[in-house]
Protein backbone atom coordinates (compact mmCIF):
# COMPACT_ATOMS: atom_id res chain seq x y z
CA UNK A 1 0.00 0.00 0.00
CA UNK A 2 1.33 3.51 -0.81
CA UNK A 3 2.25 5.66 2.18
CA UNK A 4 -0.49 8.08 3.07
CA UNK A 5 0.40 11.74 2.25
CA UNK A 6 0.20 13.85 5.40
CA UNK A 7 -1.13 17.39 5.17
CA UNK A 8 0.06 20.08 7.56
CA UNK A 9 -0.35 20.29 10.41
CA UNK A 10 0.49 16.70 11.29
CA UNK A 11 2.26 14.89 14.10
CA UNK A 12 5.62 13.48 13.00
CA UNK A 13 6.57 9.84 13.50
CA UNK A 14 8.34 9.25 16.84
CA UNK A 15 11.98 10.29 16.31
CA UNK A 16 11.07 11.51 12.83
CA UNK A 17 11.54 14.95 11.30
CA UNK A 18 9.37 17.34 9.36
CA UNK A 19 9.63 17.58 5.57
CA UNK A 20 11.29 20.26 3.48
CA UNK A 21 9.69 23.71 3.92
CA UNK A 22 8.11 22.62 7.15
CA UNK A 23 9.07 23.25 10.77
CA UNK A 24 8.25 21.61 14.07
CA UNK A 25 6.10 23.83 16.25
CA UNK A 26 6.96 23.16 19.91
CA UNK A 27 3.66 24.52 21.22
CA UNK A 28 1.40 22.62 18.84
CA UNK A 29 3.86 19.68 18.68
CA UNK A 30 3.06 19.42 14.98
CA UNK A 31 4.85 19.74 11.65
CA UNK A 32 3.65 23.02 10.13
CA UNK A 33 4.27 24.93 6.90
CA UNK A 34 7.01 27.53 6.63
CA UNK A 35 6.29 30.83 4.88
CA UNK A 36 7.97 31.50 1.53
CA UNK A 37 10.56 34.27 0.94
CA UNK A 38 8.85 37.68 0.95
CA UNK A 39 6.38 36.56 3.62
CA UNK A 40 6.35 35.95 7.38
CA UNK A 41 4.19 34.02 9.88
CA UNK A 42 1.18 36.16 10.75
CA UNK A 43 -0.47 33.38 12.77
CA UNK A 44 1.35 30.32 14.05
CA UNK A 45 -0.12 26.89 13.53
CA UNK A 46 -2.20 24.94 16.03
CA UNK A 47 -3.07 21.24 16.19
CA UNK A 48 -5.91 21.89 13.76
CA UNK A 49 -4.83 24.88 11.61
CA UNK A 50 -1.71 25.52 9.56
CA UNK A 51 0.54 28.58 9.62
CA UNK A 52 -1.00 31.74 8.19
CA UNK A 53 1.50 33.76 6.17
CA UNK A 54 1.41 37.41 5.18
CA UNK A 55 3.52 39.57 2.82
CA UNK A 56 6.38 41.64 4.18
CA UNK A 57 5.70 45.34 4.58
CA UNK A 58 7.66 48.01 2.65
CA UNK A 59 11.37 48.20 3.52
CA UNK A 60 11.28 44.74 5.10
CA UNK A 61 12.17 41.35 3.68
CA UNK A 62 12.62 37.63 4.25
CA UNK A 63 15.09 35.85 2.02
CA UNK A 64 14.43 32.25 3.08
CA UNK A 65 11.52 29.95 3.88
CA UNK A 66 10.74 30.92 7.46
CA UNK A 67 8.33 31.14 10.37
CA UNK A 68 9.45 34.49 11.77
CA UNK A 69 6.72 36.70 13.25
CA UNK A 70 8.12 39.84 11.59
CA UNK A 71 10.11 40.48 8.42
CA UNK A 72 13.65 41.82 8.70
CA UNK A 73 14.30 45.52 8.12
CA UNK A 74 16.28 46.39 5.02
CA UNK A 75 19.59 48.14 5.62
CA UNK A 76 19.85 51.90 5.48
CA UNK A 77 20.27 53.69 2.19
CA UNK A 78 23.71 53.47 0.56
CA UNK A 79 26.18 56.22 1.43
CA UNK A 80 27.66 58.62 -1.13
CA UNK A 81 30.77 56.47 -1.64
CA UNK A 82 28.62 53.43 -2.39
CA UNK A 83 26.33 52.19 -5.12
CA UNK A 84 23.22 50.11 -4.60
CA UNK A 85 23.90 46.85 -6.41
CA UNK A 86 20.77 45.14 -5.10
CA UNK A 87 17.60 47.00 -4.20
CA UNK A 88 15.51 46.33 -1.11
CA UNK A 89 12.60 44.06 -2.06
CA UNK A 90 10.26 41.83 -0.07
CA UNK A 91 12.63 38.92 -0.77
CA UNK A 92 16.07 40.47 -0.44
CA UNK A 93 17.98 43.06 1.53
CA UNK A 94 19.56 46.12 -0.05
CA UNK A 95 23.23 45.53 -0.96
CA UNK A 96 25.64 48.44 -1.07
CA UNK A 97 29.06 48.06 -2.72
CA UNK A 98 31.84 50.57 -3.12
CA UNK A 99 31.77 52.75 -6.18
CA UNK A 100 34.65 52.67 -8.72
CA UNK A 101 37.90 53.98 -7.27
CA UNK A 102 36.95 52.77 -3.79
CA UNK A 103 37.29 49.43 -1.99
CA UNK A 104 35.57 47.83 1.00
CA UNK A 105 37.61 48.48 4.12
CA UNK A 106 35.00 46.97 6.45
CA UNK A 107 32.67 44.35 5.06
CA UNK A 108 29.45 42.94 6.43
CA UNK A 109 27.62 39.70 5.70
CA UNK A 110 26.42 41.09 2.39
CA UNK A 111 27.84 44.21 0.82
CA UNK A 112 30.06 46.74 2.52
CA UNK A 113 29.85 48.67 5.77
CA UNK A 114 32.72 51.10 5.11
CA UNK A 115 34.34 52.09 1.82
CA UNK A 116 37.74 53.72 1.44
CA UNK A 117 39.30 55.41 -1.55
CA UNK A 118 41.85 53.33 -3.45
CA UNK A 119 45.43 54.39 -2.85
CA UNK A 120 46.98 56.37 -5.70
CA UNK A 121 50.59 55.61 -6.58
CA UNK A 122 52.57 58.80 -7.03
CA UNK A 123 55.03 59.46 -9.88
CA UNK A 124 58.00 57.10 -9.64
CA UNK A 125 55.72 54.39 -8.29
CA UNK A 126 53.38 52.04 -10.10
CA UNK A 127 50.67 49.58 -9.19
CA UNK A 128 52.19 46.31 -8.00
CA UNK A 129 48.85 44.80 -7.06
CA UNK A 130 45.63 46.35 -8.31
CA UNK A 131 42.80 47.16 -5.95
CA UNK A 132 39.91 44.73 -5.67
CA UNK A 133 36.45 45.06 -4.14
CA UNK A 134 37.96 44.25 -0.75
CA UNK A 135 41.65 45.19 -0.95
CA UNK A 136 43.60 48.39 -1.51
CA UNK A 137 46.11 49.07 -4.28
CA UNK A 138 49.71 48.14 -3.49
CA UNK A 139 52.34 50.49 -4.95
CA UNK A 140 55.97 49.69 -5.77
CA UNK A 141 58.90 51.87 -6.79
CA UNK A 142 59.42 51.78 -10.53
CA UNK A 143 62.35 49.44 -11.08
CA UNK A 144 65.27 50.32 -13.37
CA UNK A 145 64.27 50.97 -16.94
CA UNK A 146 60.66 51.66 -15.99
CA UNK A 147 58.75 54.76 -14.98
CA UNK A 148 55.39 56.16 -14.01
CA UNK A 149 54.71 59.87 -14.43
CA UNK A 150 51.17 59.79 -13.09
CA UNK A 151 49.37 59.82 -9.76
CA UNK A 152 47.07 56.89 -10.31
CA UNK A 153 45.43 53.87 -8.72
CA UNK A 154 45.67 51.91 -11.98
CA UNK A 155 48.87 52.84 -13.82
CA UNK A 156 51.73 50.35 -13.72
CA UNK A 157 55.41 51.17 -14.24
CA UNK A 158 56.13 51.08 -17.97
CA UNK A 159 59.50 50.62 -19.64
CA UNK A 160 61.36 53.66 -20.95
CA UNK A 161 61.36 54.02 -24.66
CA UNK A 162 64.64 53.04 -26.27
CA UNK A 163 66.12 55.88 -28.30
CA UNK A 164 68.38 56.03 -31.32
CA UNK A 165 69.80 59.12 -29.63
CA UNK A 166 68.99 60.04 -26.03
CA UNK A 167 68.22 63.69 -25.30
CA UNK A 168 67.42 63.10 -21.62
CA UNK A 169 67.77 59.72 -19.93
CA UNK A 170 64.70 58.38 -18.22
CA UNK A 171 64.25 57.98 -14.50
CA UNK A 172 61.62 56.42 -12.24
CA UNK A 173 59.13 59.24 -12.81
CA UNK A 174 59.96 60.25 -16.39
CA UNK A 175 60.32 58.49 -19.71
CA UNK A 176 63.53 58.81 -21.66
CA UNK A 177 63.40 61.74 -24.08
CA UNK A 178 64.70 60.98 -27.56
CA UNK A 179 66.07 63.47 -30.03
CA UNK A 180 64.22 64.09 -33.27
CA UNK A 181 65.54 60.82 -34.67
CA UNK A 182 62.75 58.29 -34.21
CA UNK A 183 62.92 56.13 -31.08
CA UNK A 184 63.38 52.40 -31.55
CA UNK A 185 59.88 51.57 -30.52
CA UNK A 186 56.56 51.31 -32.29
CA UNK A 187 54.50 54.39 -31.50
CA UNK A 188 50.74 54.67 -31.54
CA UNK A 189 49.42 57.35 -33.92
CA UNK A 190 49.64 60.72 -32.22
CA UNK A 191 51.41 59.32 -29.18
CA UNK A 192 54.52 61.03 -27.88
CA UNK A 193 57.20 58.94 -26.21
CA UNK A 194 54.85 56.42 -24.59
CA UNK A 195 55.72 52.71 -24.55
CA UNK A 196 53.29 50.58 -26.53
CA UNK A 197 53.03 47.02 -25.29
CA UNK A 198 52.81 44.40 -27.98
CA UNK A 199 50.26 42.44 -26.03
CA UNK A 200 46.68 43.41 -26.69
CA UNK A 201 45.67 43.31 -23.03
CA UNK A 202 45.41 46.55 -21.11
CA UNK A 203 48.60 47.88 -19.60
CA UNK A 204 46.75 48.04 -16.29
CA UNK A 205 45.90 44.36 -16.02
CA UNK A 206 47.98 41.95 -14.00
CA UNK A 207 50.96 44.12 -13.31
CA UNK A 208 53.90 41.96 -12.44
CA UNK A 209 55.71 42.69 -9.19
CA UNK A 210 59.30 43.86 -9.42
CA UNK A 211 61.91 41.84 -7.57
CA UNK A 212 62.21 43.11 -4.01
CA UNK A 213 65.97 43.37 -4.26
CA UNK A 214 68.19 43.93 -7.22
CA UNK A 215 71.69 42.92 -6.06
CA UNK A 216 72.60 39.52 -7.38
CA UNK A 217 69.56 39.29 -9.62
CA UNK A 218 70.00 41.85 -12.34
CA UNK A 219 71.63 42.42 -15.70
CA UNK A 220 71.68 45.95 -14.43
CA UNK A 221 74.04 48.84 -14.45
CA UNK A 222 74.69 50.57 -11.12
CA UNK A 223 73.72 54.30 -10.91
CA UNK A 224 72.13 57.16 -8.48
CA UNK A 225 70.31 57.36 -4.84
CA UNK A 226 68.19 54.65 -3.21
CA UNK A 227 64.44 54.57 -3.81
CA UNK A 228 62.05 55.68 -1.06
CA UNK A 229 60.11 52.92 0.65
CA UNK A 230 56.61 54.27 0.14
CA UNK A 231 54.93 55.21 -3.09
CA UNK A 232 51.39 56.16 -2.37
CA UNK A 233 49.65 59.45 -1.89
CA UNK A 234 47.11 60.52 0.68
CA UNK A 235 47.68 57.66 3.08
Amino acid sequence: LPAQVAFTPYAPEPGGTCRLREYYDQTAQMCCSKCPPGQHAKVFCTKTSDTVCDSCEDSTYTQLWNWVPECLSCGSRCSSDQVETQACTREQNRICTCRPGWYCALSKQEGCRLCAQLRKCRPGFGVARPGTETSDVVCKPCAPGTFSNTTSSTDICRPHQICHVVAIPGNASMDAVCTSTSPTRSMAPGAVHLPQPVSTRSQHTQPTPAPSTAPGTSFLLPVGPSPPAEGSTGD
Epitope: G145, I162, V166, P169, P195, A214, S218, F219, V223
Partner: antibody
Framework: QSLEESGGGLVKPEGSLTLTCAVS?????????ICWARQAPGKGLEWIAC????????AYYASWAKGRLSISKASSTTVTLQMTSLTAADTATYFC????????????????????WGPGTLVTVSS | IEMTQTPSSVSAAVGGTVTINCQSS??????LAWYQQKPGQPPKLLIY???YLTSGVPSRFSGSRSGTEFTLTISDLECDDAATYYC????????????FGGGTEVVVK
Amino acid sequence: QSLEESGGGLVKPEGSLTLTCAVSGFDLNSYYWICWARQAPGKGLEWIACIDGGSTGSAYYASWAKGRLSISKASSTTVTLQMTSLTAADTATYFCARVQSYVGYANYGYPNYFNLWGPGTLVTVSS
Amino acid sequence: IEMTQTPSSVSAAVGGTVTINCQSSEDIDSYLAWYQQKPGQPPKLLIYHASYLTSGVPSRFSGSRSGTEFTLTISDLECDDAATYYCQSAYYSSSADNTFGGGTEVVVK
Protein backbone atom coordinates in the same frame (compact mmCIF):
# COMPACT_ATOMS: atom_id res chain seq x y z
CA GLN B 1 74.67 56.07 -35.15
CA SER B 2 76.91 53.08 -35.46
CA LEU B 3 79.45 50.89 -33.70
CA GLU B 4 82.41 49.20 -35.31
CA GLU B 5 84.74 46.60 -33.85
CA SER B 6 88.37 46.19 -34.88
CA GLY B 7 91.47 44.34 -33.73
CA GLY B 8 90.34 40.80 -34.45
CA GLY B 9 92.52 38.26 -36.19
CA LEU B 10 94.61 35.18 -35.64
CA VAL B 11 96.33 34.80 -32.29
CA LYS B 12 98.26 31.93 -30.74
CA PRO B 13 97.08 30.11 -27.61
CA GLU B 14 98.10 31.91 -24.39
CA GLY B 15 98.44 35.07 -26.48
CA SER B 16 96.82 38.46 -25.89
CA LEU B 17 94.67 40.74 -28.01
CA THR B 18 92.98 44.11 -27.66
CA LEU B 19 89.70 44.74 -29.45
CA THR B 20 88.41 48.25 -30.07
CA CYS B 21 84.83 49.46 -30.41
CA ALA B 22 84.54 52.80 -32.19
CA VAL B 23 81.28 54.72 -31.89
CA SER B 24 80.02 57.28 -34.35
CA GLY B 25 76.93 59.47 -34.60
CA PHE B 26 76.62 59.83 -30.81
CA ASP B 27 78.81 60.73 -27.87
CA LEU B 28 80.06 58.24 -25.34
CA ASN B 29 78.53 59.83 -22.27
CA SER B 30 76.55 58.87 -19.21
CA TYR B 31 73.50 58.31 -21.39
CA TYR B 32 74.92 55.03 -22.68
CA TRP B 33 76.82 51.94 -21.62
CA ILE B 34 78.90 49.91 -24.06
CA CYS B 35 78.99 46.14 -23.74
CA TRP B 36 80.85 43.27 -25.38
CA ALA B 37 79.36 39.92 -26.34
CA ARG B 38 80.74 37.08 -28.41
CA GLN B 39 79.54 34.22 -30.56
CA ALA B 40 81.59 31.11 -31.28
CA PRO B 41 81.21 29.77 -34.86
CA GLY B 42 77.78 28.13 -35.19
CA LYS B 43 77.03 28.73 -31.52
CA GLY B 44 74.88 31.07 -29.43
CA LEU B 45 75.53 34.50 -27.97
CA GLU B 46 77.51 35.03 -24.78
CA TRP B 47 77.67 38.28 -22.83
CA ILE B 48 81.13 39.38 -21.66
CA ALA B 49 81.21 42.81 -19.99
CA CYS B 50 79.79 46.34 -19.89
CA ILE B 51 81.20 49.79 -19.09
CA ASP B 52 79.62 53.15 -18.32
CA GLY B 53 80.06 55.54 -21.25
CA GLY B 54 80.25 58.42 -18.78
CA SER B 55 83.03 59.47 -16.45
CA THR B 56 82.47 56.89 -13.69
CA GLY B 57 84.37 54.11 -15.44
CA SER B 58 82.06 51.61 -13.72
CA ALA B 59 82.31 48.20 -15.34
CA TYR B 60 81.10 44.69 -14.68
CA TYR B 61 81.81 41.29 -16.11
CA ALA B 62 80.43 37.83 -16.64
CA SER B 63 81.95 35.63 -13.93
CA TRP B 64 84.02 33.60 -16.40
CA ALA B 65 85.56 36.77 -17.87
CA LYS B 66 86.81 38.32 -14.63
CA GLY B 67 90.58 38.62 -14.45
CA ARG B 68 91.25 37.50 -18.02
CA LEU B 69 89.28 40.11 -19.93
CA SER B 70 89.29 43.82 -19.21
CA ILE B 71 86.93 46.47 -20.57
CA SER B 72 87.88 50.15 -20.56
CA LYS B 73 86.88 53.46 -22.08
CA ALA B 74 89.86 54.57 -24.12
CA SER B 75 88.43 57.87 -25.36
CA SER B 76 85.16 59.69 -25.91
CA THR B 77 84.62 57.55 -29.00
CA THR B 78 86.26 54.20 -28.21
CA VAL B 79 85.92 51.32 -25.79
CA THR B 80 88.47 48.51 -25.66
CA LEU B 81 88.40 44.88 -24.57
CA GLN B 82 91.77 43.48 -23.53
CA MET B 83 92.00 39.70 -23.62
CA THR B 84 94.81 37.62 -22.15
CA SER B 85 95.63 33.91 -21.84
CA LEU B 86 93.57 33.14 -24.91
CA THR B 87 92.56 29.56 -25.72
CA ALA B 88 90.80 27.90 -28.65
CA ALA B 89 87.55 28.29 -26.69
CA ASP B 90 87.88 32.07 -27.15
CA THR B 91 87.57 31.72 -30.91
CA ALA B 92 84.48 33.73 -31.77
CA THR B 93 83.06 36.80 -33.42
CA TYR B 94 83.21 39.61 -30.86
CA PHE B 95 80.43 42.23 -30.92
CA CYS B 96 80.18 45.53 -29.13
CA ALA B 97 76.67 46.75 -28.36
CA ARG B 98 75.07 49.83 -26.86
CA VAL B 99 72.73 50.01 -23.88
CA GLN B 100 70.68 53.07 -22.99
CA SER B 101 71.45 54.47 -19.54
CA TYR B 102 69.11 55.50 -16.76
CA VAL B 103 69.11 58.10 -14.01
CA GLY B 104 68.21 55.98 -11.04
CA TYR B 105 69.13 54.17 -7.90
CA ALA B 106 72.58 53.16 -6.65
CA ASN B 107 71.42 49.69 -5.71
CA TYR B 108 69.69 49.21 -9.02
CA GLY B 109 70.86 49.86 -12.53
CA TYR B 110 69.61 49.65 -16.05
CA PRO B 111 68.38 46.62 -17.96
CA ASN B 112 70.71 45.62 -20.77
CA TYR B 113 68.62 45.87 -23.88
CA PHE B 114 71.20 45.91 -26.66
CA ASN B 115 69.58 48.16 -29.24
CA LEU B 116 72.61 48.96 -31.37
CA TRP B 117 75.27 46.45 -32.44
CA GLY B 118 78.48 46.54 -34.39
CA PRO B 119 79.02 44.07 -37.27
CA GLY B 120 81.52 42.09 -35.20
CA THR B 121 85.20 41.17 -35.50
CA LEU B 122 86.45 37.59 -35.72
CA VAL B 123 89.09 36.36 -33.28
CA THR B 124 90.71 33.02 -34.09
CA VAL B 125 92.91 31.38 -31.47
CA SER B 126 95.04 28.71 -33.08
CA SER B 127 98.65 27.58 -33.20
CA ILE C 1 70.49 33.02 -14.18
CA GLU C 2 70.05 30.40 -16.87
CA MET C 3 67.82 30.90 -19.86
CA THR C 4 66.42 27.69 -21.34
CA GLN C 5 65.09 28.26 -24.84
CA THR C 6 62.92 25.75 -26.70
CA PRO C 7 62.71 24.41 -29.32
CA SER C 8 66.22 24.56 -30.82
CA SER C 9 64.70 24.49 -34.29
CA VAL C 10 61.23 24.95 -35.72
CA SER C 11 59.85 24.81 -39.22
CA ALA C 12 56.63 26.36 -40.49
CA ALA C 13 55.02 27.35 -43.77
CA VAL C 14 54.63 30.89 -45.06
CA GLY C 15 51.54 32.39 -43.39
CA GLY C 16 51.85 30.06 -40.41
CA THR C 17 52.61 30.79 -36.78
CA VAL C 18 55.71 29.98 -34.76
CA THR C 19 56.01 30.03 -30.97
CA ILE C 20 59.36 30.11 -29.16
CA ASN C 21 59.60 29.64 -25.40
CA CYS C 22 62.18 30.84 -22.93
CA GLN C 23 62.33 29.76 -19.29
CA SER C 24 64.33 31.70 -16.71
CA SER C 25 65.91 29.85 -13.78
CA GLU C 26 65.16 32.83 -11.52
CA ASP C 27 62.50 35.51 -11.31
CA ILE C 28 63.62 38.24 -13.70
CA ASP C 29 60.37 40.20 -13.58
CA SER C 30 59.70 41.36 -17.16
CA TYR C 31 63.36 42.05 -17.96
CA LEU C 32 63.57 39.96 -21.09
CA ALA C 33 64.51 40.80 -24.66
CA TRP C 34 64.13 38.91 -27.93
CA TYR C 35 66.65 39.23 -30.78
CA GLN C 36 66.66 38.12 -34.39
CA GLN C 37 69.94 37.15 -36.02
CA LYS C 38 70.56 36.32 -39.64
CA PRO C 39 73.77 34.64 -40.87
CA GLY C 40 76.75 37.01 -41.04
CA GLN C 41 74.85 39.80 -39.22
CA PRO C 42 74.73 41.03 -35.62
CA PRO C 43 71.57 40.39 -33.60
CA LYS C 44 68.67 42.83 -33.93
CA LEU C 45 66.54 43.82 -30.92
CA LEU C 46 62.90 42.92 -31.62
CA ILE C 47 61.16 43.03 -28.25
CA TYR C 48 62.16 44.39 -24.86
CA HIS C 49 60.63 44.25 -21.39
CA ALA C 50 58.94 40.99 -22.41
CA SER C 51 56.24 42.52 -24.60
CA TYR C 52 57.32 45.90 -25.99
CA LEU C 53 57.98 46.03 -29.70
CA THR C 54 60.84 48.14 -31.06
CA SER C 55 60.12 50.41 -34.02
CA GLY C 56 60.28 49.02 -37.51
CA VAL C 57 59.44 45.55 -36.22
CA PRO C 58 56.15 44.26 -37.67
CA SER C 59 53.27 43.66 -35.27
CA ARG C 60 53.30 40.04 -36.43
CA PHE C 61 55.92 39.66 -33.70
CA SER C 62 54.63 39.60 -30.14
CA GLY C 63 56.00 38.74 -26.74
CA SER C 64 54.35 37.65 -23.52
CA ARG C 65 55.26 36.62 -19.99
CA SER C 66 53.81 34.20 -17.48
CA GLY C 67 55.94 34.10 -14.34
CA THR C 68 59.39 32.92 -15.40
CA GLU C 69 58.17 31.69 -18.78
CA PHE C 70 58.41 33.97 -21.79
CA THR C 71 57.05 33.46 -25.27
CA LEU C 72 57.84 34.96 -28.67
CA THR C 73 55.11 34.46 -31.25
CA ILE C 74 55.59 35.14 -34.94
CA SER C 75 52.32 35.04 -36.88
CA ASP C 76 51.67 35.33 -40.62
CA LEU C 77 55.18 33.98 -41.17
CA GLU C 78 57.16 35.48 -44.07
CA CYS C 79 60.26 34.20 -45.83
CA ASP C 80 62.23 37.11 -44.34
CA ASP C 81 61.52 35.77 -40.84
CA ALA C 82 63.89 32.86 -41.40
CA ALA C 83 66.60 33.47 -38.81
CA THR C 84 67.85 32.42 -35.39
CA TYR C 85 66.02 33.99 -32.45
CA TYR C 86 67.53 34.50 -29.01
CA CYS C 87 65.95 35.42 -25.71
CA GLN C 88 68.05 37.38 -23.22
CA SER C 89 67.65 38.10 -19.55
CA ALA C 90 68.23 41.80 -19.10
CA TYR C 91 69.26 41.14 -15.50
CA TYR C 92 72.89 40.78 -14.52
CA SER C 93 74.11 38.50 -11.76
CA SER C 94 77.55 37.19 -10.94
CA SER C 95 76.26 33.68 -11.60
CA ALA C 96 75.01 34.57 -15.07
CA ASP C 97 77.75 33.33 -17.36
CA ASN C 98 75.37 33.40 -20.29
CA THR C 99 72.29 35.55 -20.08
CA PHE C 100 71.18 34.53 -23.58
CA GLY C 101 69.07 31.52 -24.41
CA GLY C 102 70.59 28.87 -26.68
CA GLY C 103 68.74 30.17 -29.72
CA THR C 104 65.95 28.87 -31.94
CA GLU C 105 66.39 28.44 -35.67
CA VAL C 106 63.22 29.30 -37.57
CA VAL C 107 62.93 27.67 -40.99
CA VAL C 108 60.25 29.01 -43.31
CA LYS C 109 58.95 26.52 -45.89
